[in-house]
Interface confidence: medium
Amino acid sequence: GPVPRSVSLPLTLKELIEELSNITQDQTPLCNGSMVWSVDLAAGGFCVALDSLTNISNCNAIYRTQRILHGLCNRKAPTTVSSLPDTKIEVAHFITKLLSYTKQLFRHGPF
């Protein structure tokens, strides 16, 4: 899941950070505690994040995140989720990891 280098990327990352920050700070249990595959974000980027979150349905709280990730993932065809073997985590924990990854990317590039 390479990250597209474009003028709008920093703005999109900032939008994602804001959305993820909203989610992580809201104290309501996210997606009723649903579990997702833990993925290697450093290796797969936003595409694997999107793949992992695609398995969550009927959760309005992450729709906007999914939409932003869709825009950040610039591959043509779906790939298999690069998961850490048999590791599932709560979607809230996943979102926290995604937020850390996105902040790191926003601070240090590449774009």
């Epitope: 804001e18 920050s21 909203n22 992580t24 700070q25 809201d26 104290q27 309501t28 249990p29 996210l30 009723n32 505690g33 649903s34 579990m35 709560e90 809230a92 924990h93 979102i95 926290t96 990891k97 850390s100």
Partner: antibody, heavy 123, light 110 residues
């Protein structure tokens, strides 16, 4: 270490306003939501509101809509509570408390508290 | 709103076991957890988180504190009770907003 330090006690007359501050240190302020909790003398704890420290957006309990304003001075890592048109029943100790889902915290629980600010409303 | 009910007072002897209960008006469970937390408040002090998500002991809290329960019925156990455990204990649900606390149980010496 994580610290939440609140402003000092206040003695006010009915109809006046009060502003209470809660200064955070020892962690990244904008990574954690901040809650406010009221405790009337000899009574239990009552949740008032939480504020998103990244966006500044507060979410209120029904009983605390109207005269209560929850805000931030994020650059100073400070959350504030302002109560206008004070009433006798506002006499209480007000606590700020940190909470959030960030890794390393206790999911959904208030894991660090300020020392409390006593507000007395009396004519 | 989820209402949490606690007994107002529990009298206990030093060295004995104290069992403090909290009953919720509806389930505080999600698929993977029961979202009930326990706080201690000594007189004149701020509350302190003891146990989160029903049974997880906060780092630095003595092992004589433990939590159990599921659904709507929860328990905080202190065994054995020591003198500095004399305080009020509050349960709090994290299942839905508005977040609510129990009325508190004051631990007193017999």
């Amino acid at each position: 270490q994580i610290q939440l330090v609140q402003s000092g006690p206040e003695l006010k007359k009915p109809g006046e306003s009060v502003k209470i501050s809660c200064k955070a240190s020892g962690y990244t302020f904008t990574d954690y939501a901040m809650h406010w909790v009221k405790q009337a003398p000899g009574k239990g704890l009552k949740w008032m509101a939480w504020i998103n420290t990244y966006t500044g957006k507060p979410t209120y309990a029904d009983d605390f809509k109207g005269r209560f304003v929850f805000s931030l001075e994020a650059s100073a890592s400070t959350a504030t509570l302002q109560i206008s048109n004070l009433k006798n029943e506002d006499t209480a100790t007000y606590f700020c408390a940190r909470a959030g889902r960030t890794e390393g915290t206790h999911y959904y629980a208030m894991d660090a508290w300020g020392q409390g600010t006593s507000v007395t409303v009396s004519s | 709103d989820i209402v949490l009910t606690q007994s107002p007072v529990l009298a206990v002897s030093l060295g004995q076991r104290a069992t403090i209960s909290c009953r919720a008006s509806q389930s505080v469970s999600i698929s993977s957890s029961d979202l009930m937390h326990w706080y201690q408040q000594r007189p004149g002090h701020q509350p302190k988180l003891l146990i989160y998500r029903t049974s997880n002991l906060v780092s630095g809290i003595p092992a004589r504190f433990s939590g159990s329960g599921s659904g709507t019925d929860f328990t905080l156990t202190i065994d054995p009770v020591q003198a500095d455990d004399i305080a009020a204990y509050y349960c709090q649900q994290g299942r839905e907003s508005p977040w609510t606390f129990g009325g508190g149980t004051k631990l007193e010496l017999k």
